[in-house]
């Protein structure tokens, strides 16, 4: 059987929902010594990264400038040591978004709840669309999906102060195609006497996932390398 | 103080339409949700729909869904319920609710459907 | 739609005596219930929302609670003006539905 190389990751900075016309950057982290990536877009080359020098870096950043909704969709990539390539990465959604309309989002009965009541958002967006979004800040991809003509709604079982936090919504006009986001909507849940000290509460960091972290080897980096090479011949 | 001032009754004939209001003072009406229920004479409770004046969303019982339309007028802070083809089962007293768990009720107008 | 049986439908008692109303869900309401009063001239007033909590204003003597899908309305004792029509309202899953009232009298 062919040889390959294990998958890279791919991951977009900052995020995946990418404002029309701003510029998106994806990036493919795979292994020292790769002497190139490759970006794909729905599944056809699309960017070409040559690390230099390519022993000291452990990935590369695609930049999309100028996004649109041609640009919007699914992204992997894969790498190459020497002459062997790796495993294609996970592929990744790539959004864009401010497009067309704005919509307005409520929650029933209000955005002041408490704990064991039932909650209901409402996404309201009058030009054509049948998909809406709904989206907790720090939980981006965390997408809950619902369906309708100028509206659409998204039921919430009993809350908890787990699901305390802002949401915004999104009207989409295709899967990589949504429009600008909503006005915030802060929900604040109380008396979760039972399990209080234990609610997890909302990062007000971006998703973990939505960061780069591509490293340059130093010294130690090539030390270590080398000794757990050697350790796993020894193990051999 | 909260109030929701609702006309005391209309009289309207067979087959008509009519406009019921709900004017709100106290609170910010964009905020909340308002409701409509209904209550035929001597029996219980009905829930028409709802409508929250800031986003326009509207929410409707399937079975008013041809029969009333709701909007609101957020310049005057007051809601709209246009009741059509109006026959002697619409003959009830008509309350506004504010808030999205009812908090504030109106005092109710009373729609007879007579000839 | 979810149903919401209420018992009594009607219920006399005297005053100083401690009632209880209850309403049953047909589904999962979780704490998304109110308690509404009706005076005879058909002003309506909130007592109780989210099961438990007591509006604002309201006497002490009123309280809400839950066991299982089964909602209760306790008043502890019954004053004059309490003789009046009370419903359970579920506002957990639309459409909205209100228990079929309980008619309080004087004994």
């Known amino acids: 059987p062919k040889q390959t190389l294990p998958k890279p990751i791919i991951r977009a900075e900052s995020t995946y929902m990418v404002p029309k016309e701003k510029q998106a950057t994806l990036c493919c982290q795979g292994s020292y010594g790769a002497v190139e990536y490759q970006l794909h877009f729905e599944g056809s080359l699309f960017a070409v990264e040559r690390p230099k020098p390519p022993e000291r870096i452990n990935g590369v950043k695609f930049h999309i400038p100028d996004m649109n909704s041609r640009k919007a969709g699914r992204y992997s990539c894969i790498y190459r040591v020497g002459e062997l390539w790796s495993e294609r990465s996970d592929l990744l959604d790539l959004v864009v978004t401010e497009m067309y309309d704005t919509p307005t989002l409520s929650v029933h009965p209000g955005p002041e709840v408490t704990s064991g009541e039932k909650v209901t958002f409402y996404c309201r967006l009058d030009t054509a669309t049948s998909m809406f979004l709904l989206l907790k800040e720090g939980r981006s991809r965390d997408v809950q999906r619902s369906y309708g003509k100028v509206q659409a709604e998204f039921p919430m079982g009993p809350v908890t102060t787990a699901h305390r936090g802002s949401y915004r919504c999104f009207g989409s006009y295709n899967n990589y195609a949504w429009s600008f986001p909503s006005e915030p909507v802060k929900l604040l849940v109380t008396g979760d006497i039972e399990n209080t000290s234990l609610a997890p509460t909302d990062p007000t960091f971006p998703d973990s996932w939505d960061t780069c972290l591509l490293t340059r080897e130093t010294g130690l980096q090539k030390d270590l390398a080398l000794w757990d090479h050697t350790a796993q011949n020894l193990l051999r | 103080q909260v109030q929701l001032q609702q006309p005391g009754a209309e009289l309207v004939k067979p087959g008509a339409s009519v406009r019921l209001s709900c004017k709100a003072f106290?609170?910010?009406?964009?905020?909340?949700?308002m409701h409509w229920v209904k209550q035929r004479p001597g029996q219980g409770l009905e829930w028409i729909g709802m409508?929250?004046?800031?986003?326009?969303?509207?929410k409707y019982n399937e079975k008013f869904k041809s029969k009333a339309t709701l909007t609101v007028d957020k310049s005057s802070s007051t809601a709209y319920m246009q009741l059509s083809s109006l026959t002697s089962e619409d003959s009830a007293v008509y309350f506004c609710a504010g808030d999205g768990r009812f908090a504030y009720w109106g005092q109710g107008t009373l729609v007879t459907v007579s000839a | 739609d979810i149903q919401m049986t209420q018992s009594p439908s009607s219920l006399s008692a005297s005053l100083g005596e401690r009632v209880s109303l209850t309403c049953r869900a047909s589904?999962?309401?979780?704490?998304?219930l109110n308690w509404l009063q009706q005076e005879p001239d058909g002003t309506i007033k909130r007592l109780i929302y989210?099961?438990?909590s007591l509006d604002s204003g309201v006497p002490k003597r009123f309280s809400g609670s839950r066991s299982g899908s089964d909602y209760s309305l306790t008043i502890s004792s019954l004053e004059s003006e309490d003789f009046v029509d009370y419903y359970c309202l579920q506002y957990a899953s639309s459409p909205w539905t209100f228990g079929g009232g309980t008619k309080l009298e004087i004994k």
């Open positions: 409508i929250h004046p800031n986003s326009g969303v509207t």
């Open positions: 106290g609170y910010t009406f964009t905020s909340y949700w």
């Open positions: 989210a099961t438990s």
């Open positions: 589904q999962d309401i979780g704490n998304s």
